[in-house]
């Protein structure tokens, strides 16, 4: 905290303007108004203040606001937002999807970086968190904005909280988002993407909702092998094992088209390895890849998970 | 990649008035400030002052701000300083620079520099 | 304005031994500290920050250290292409002031 010191004469500042760049932290302290400064907070991220002023900064807007910001003075806090901590952010009430977009540029990095930080800072979560909290549920508008600056922004949360996007915002998100989403999260996420899309043509429908797959099950598989859709490699590695390991031989034939043939590189990793072991030999043979590991011609398989529903 | 480029070298007589360029490339020019220092023979660094090309806004280091003017021209991603009532203390080689962060005045990228010579 | 003074002015160094110069300020400036590596003909490139954060791509060999008042820059082994003059910057407050330099040779 910086100690009340005297502001010198001819010092006082009667408007936020450069010439404050060149104040000393308890120059900052005694000479700049809080008033002042909420009101001309536009100003401040138009001047070059270092790290070290903003502390002064923020110190006096905490005494004038201790129960937390308006949303006028945060919607203009620019480089200011980047001393908040989660426990000052926990204290607003952000509405505005401009406001929400403006601390998200601010905090974008300022670095020249192609590459968008994978999951949110702290204070970026407790932000985008309070924010949606207060609209209720993720509509298109906040997830276009969230994925744009965050691409692994929906991986980051949990299926609880994935249940509140409705099947709208779906037509948002891109592949890119869905990257580090686990299998839970795409349990959630497919049936909303499988009732967005659902009037879409067959090779359109494939396109949009190819990387929400992991969630799909096995009959939905079954369904796109009769569509000859072309799946590559990549996405049906991706998918559930459990989803996978019904299929006959020819239905993943089917799904996968001329791609069949990456199978053989795969043979050893899930699914493809787990749903081998499940398929017979001689069927697996048809498929001229000497995938191998099936199960041998003359044996009889039981399923003893059904033999047990039904017990 | 971001690139300064400035001008060429200078050969001027004292009392005379010049004008620097610093072309940038590869970001976005008007999204951070455009800093100026500079380095006299043997000698270490100097701030000069800054533009935000976005805004024109700019500040200078107190005993630069009579002489010295620091400008942009958007439509050709470039900034200017214009140097006056040049003395034999102004050879220097000037540099263009710019911050990325600017809570965190670091010179993150530099120009070649331009060396400007006073002398009658 | 804050006054940032370097120490030696020169220093030479053996071939993989240890370098050290030092950075002092006239004012506690906290962390806001870079160092910067300037070669002959050549504009200074960022090394440190935060006295203590390396540049990405900078090898590891160059480590900083310090807070408040007083700051290190430790080269751990010395390389040929390591011969250059250094320079500590303070950004704690404006005008950014920069000290004299150090300039690193071999032994």
């Known amino acids: 905290e910086v100690e009340k010191t005297a502001c010198p004469s001819g010092k006082k500042a009667r408007e936020i303007d450069e010439s404050l760049i060149f104040y000393k932290k308890w120059e900052l302290e005694a000479c700049v108004d809080a008033a002042l400064l909420a009101t001309q907070m536009d100003r401040v991220n138009a001047i070059p203040f270092t790290y070290e002023q903003l502390d002064v900064l923020k110190h006096k807007l905490d005494e004038l606001y201790p129960q937390g910001y308006p949303e006028s003075v945060i919607q203009h806090l620019g480089y200011l937002f980047l001393k908040m901590s989660p426990e000052d952010i926990r204290k607003w009430n952000v509405t505005s999807l401009e406001t929400l977009k403006a601390l998200l540029e601010v905090n974008k990095g300022h670095e020249m970086s192609p590459q968008a930080p994978r999951r949110p800072l702290p204070q970026v979560a407790t932000l985008i968190d309070r924010f949606v909290k207060g609209r209720g549920q993720l509509d298109k508008d906040t997830l276009d904005t969230l994925t744009a600056f965050y691409p692994g922004y929906l991986c980051s949360l949990s299926p609880e909280e994935l249940s509140s996007v409705p099947p709208s915002s779906i037509w948002a998100v891109r592949p890119q988002d869905l990257d580090t989403c686990d299998p839970r999260q795409l349990d959630v996420l497919y049936p909303k993407a499988r009732l967005a899309f659902q009037n879409m043509n067959g090779s359109e429908y494939f396109v949009k909702i190819q990387s929400f797959l992991g969630g799909a099950p096995t009959e939905d598989l079954k369904a796109l092998s009769q569509q000859n859709v072309s799946m590559d490699l990549a996405t049906f590695m991706k998918l559930r094992t459990d989803a996978v390991l019904p299929l006959t031989v020819a239905e993943v034939q089917k799904l996968l088209g001329p791609h069949v043939e990456g199978l053989k590189a795969e043979e050893r990793h899930r699914p493809v390895r787990d749903w081998i072991l499940r398929q017979r030999q001689d069927d697996l043979d048809t498929l001229g890849l000497g995938l191998q590991g099936g199960i041998p011609n003359g044996y009889l398989v039981l399923d003893l998970s059904m033999q047990e529903a039904l017990s | 990649q971001v690139q300064l480029q400035q001008s060429g070298a200078e050969l001027v007589k004292p009392g005379a008035s010049l004008k620097l360029s610093c072309k940038a490339s590869?970001?976005?020019?008007?999204?951070?400030?455009m800093h100026w220092v500079r380095q006299a023979p043997g000698q270490g660094l100097e701030w000069i002052g800054a533009i935000h090309p976005n805004s024109d806004n700019t500040i200078y280091y107190q005993k630069f701000k009579s002489r010295f003017t620091i400008t942009v021209d958007k439509s050709t991603s470039t900034a200017y300083m214009q140097l006056s009532s040049l003395t034999s203390e102004d050879t220097a080689v000037y540099y263009c620079?710019?911050?990325?962060?600017?809570?965190?005045?670091?010179?993150?990228?530099w120009g070649q520099g331009t060396t400007v010579t006073v002398s009658s | 304005d804050i006054v940032m003074t370097q120490s030696p002015d020169s220093l030479a160094v053996s071939l993989g031994e240890r370098a050290t110069i030092t950075c002092k300020s006239s004012?506690?400036?906290?962390?806001?500290l870079a160092w910067y590596q300037q070669k002959p003909g050549q504009p200074p490139k960022l090394l440190i920050y935060?006295?203590?954060t390396r540049e990405s791509g900078v090898p590891d060999r160059f480590s900083g250290s310090g807070s408040g008042t007083d700051f290190t820059l430790t080269i751990s082994s010395l390389q040929a292409e390591d011969v250059a003059v250094y320079y500590c910057q303070q950004y704690s407050s404006y005008p950014l002031t920069f000290g004299q330099g150090t300039k690193l040779e071999i032994k």
């Open positions: 590869g970001y976005t020019f008007t999204s951070y400030w």
């Open positions: 620079a710019i911050i990325i962060t600017p809570v965190v005045p670091k010179f993150d990228y």
């Open positions: 004012h506690d400036v906290g962390t806001s």
């Open positions: 935060w006295a203590s």
